[in-house]
């Protein structure tokens, strides 16, 4: 297939406080080999939300089984959303490297806005 693209189909998602937010991301190709990570924000100050390779992210679950052969779906669900979670989330593909993986391509981002919890 052609060179990998990172697809985030939704420019924005709105979720009520206390609910879960699904952030969708998929790849158009299995190549190059390497993990994906989710970040909030861009640039040097971005916050790591999920790392496919390692780490403990108790509020984050993957929508698909990432270990499944030929999986292209790297969507995540973040539970118990609060106003502090608002921001733009980027799904980023890394190319496997030595000693460190190298950022390969980022999705366009999905802006998460948080509505007040219905009374």
């Amino acid at each position: 297939e052609d060179e990998l693209q990172v697809i985030q189909p939704e420019k924005s998602v709105s979720v009520a406080a206390g609910e879960s937010a699904t952030l969708r991301c998929a790849m158009t190709s299995l190549i190059p080999v390497g993990p994906i990570m989710w970040f909030r924000g861009a640039g040097a100050g971005r916050e790591l939300i999920y790392n496919q390779k390692e780490g403990h992210f108790p509020r984050v679950t993957t929508v698909s089984e990432l270990t499944k052969r030929n999986n292209l779906d790297f969507s995540i669900s973040i539970s118990n959303i609060t106003p502090a979670d608002a921001g733009t989330y980027y799904c980023v593909k890394f190319r496997k490297g030595s000693p460190d993986d190298v950022e390969f391509k980022s999705g366009a981002g999905t802006e998460l806005s948080v509505r007040a919890k219905p009374s």
């Epitope: 297939e1 052609d2 693209q5 697809i7 189909p9 699904t22 969708r24 998929a26 790849m27 158009t28 929508v63 698909s64 089984e65 292209l72 779906d73 969507s75």
Partner: antibody
Framework: QVQLVESGGGVVQPGRSLRLSCAAS????????MNWVRQAPGKGLEWVSA????????FYADSVKGRFTISRDNSKNTLYLQMNSLRAEDTAVYYC???????????????WGQGTTVTVSS | EIVMTQSPGTLSLSPGERATLSCRAS???????LAWYQQKPGQAPRLLIY???SRATGIPDRFSGSGSGTDFTLTISRLEPEDFAVYYC?????????FGGGTKVEIK
């Protein structure tokens, strides 16, 4: 606007062949996977075949594997379905449909043509 | 091959009522690959819900999707006259991209 227009349907005898076409406009055809879905008279939807954006990967339902061939010409913005060894049970309205995103077979099919009717009868 | 089973086959309701349509997979599937379509007589299907729970562009918020694993639901909170149609779920992703048999929502 985004549009898919199927053509090539008709009445054909069992064992014969037919080629359906689907002309796409209003979107970057070469960026999206495409599908054929059929619907027999009074019945539900049946997915038939799909093809990746570049055309290098193809997928088929078991019921048509070995008889039908999906292809595309990105320079002409056209999707094809070559149907050989046709059977009475292939009688249906055939729709072409565009994948919702650039990822093949992810999330759904968001644009559909109005369909072309294929009748297989002696 | 995963089989998608929709129930009920027919739902007879009045405008203003709530419709709950079920789609069950024969084995667990990712919600990213579950879509719902609406089809009216003589028309092509229309994508309503993708990823089990996200409304497609232009779909009114009375339509909602939910579920995970093997059990998925399409809910129409208050039926409008134009909602009487046949609804199909579809499993995407792997091949074949199976449709359920459909649920017809008819006027009571």
């Amino acid at each position: 606007q985004v549009q898919l227009v199927e053509s090539g349907g008709g009445v054909v005898q069992p064992g014969r062949s037919l080629r359906l076409s689907c002309a796409a406009s209003g979107f970057t055809f070469s960026a999206y996977g495409m599908n054929w879905v059929r619907q027999a008279p009074g019945k539900g939807l049946e997915w038939v075949s799909a093809i990746s954006a570049s055309g290098r990967s193809t997928f088929y339902a078991d019921s048509v594997k070995g008889r039908f061939t999906i292809s595309r010409d990105n320079s002409k913005n056209t999707l094809y379905l070559q149907m050989n060894s046709l059977r009475a049970e292939d009688t249906a309205v055939y729709y072409c449909a565009k994948d919702f995103t650039e990822v093949v077979g992810w999330l759904g099919m968001d644009v559909w043509g109005q369909g072309t009717t294929v009748t297989v009868s002696s | 091959e995963i089989v998608m089973t929709q129930s009920p086959g027919t739902l007879s309701l009045s405008p203003g009522e709530r419709a709950t349509l079920s789609c069950r997979a024969s084995q667990s599937v990712s919600s990213s690959y579950l879509a719902w379509y609406q089809q009216k007589p003589g028309q092509a299907p229309r994508l309503l819900i993708y990823g089990a729970s996200s409304r497609a562009t232009g779909i009114p918020d009375r339509f909602s999707g939910s579920g995970s694993g093997t059990d998925f639901t399409l809910t129409i909170s208050r039926l409008e006259p134009e909602d009487f149609a046949v609804y199909y779920c579809q499993l995407l992703g792997s091949s074949p991209r199976t449709f359920g048999g459909g649920t017809k929502v008819e006027i009571k």
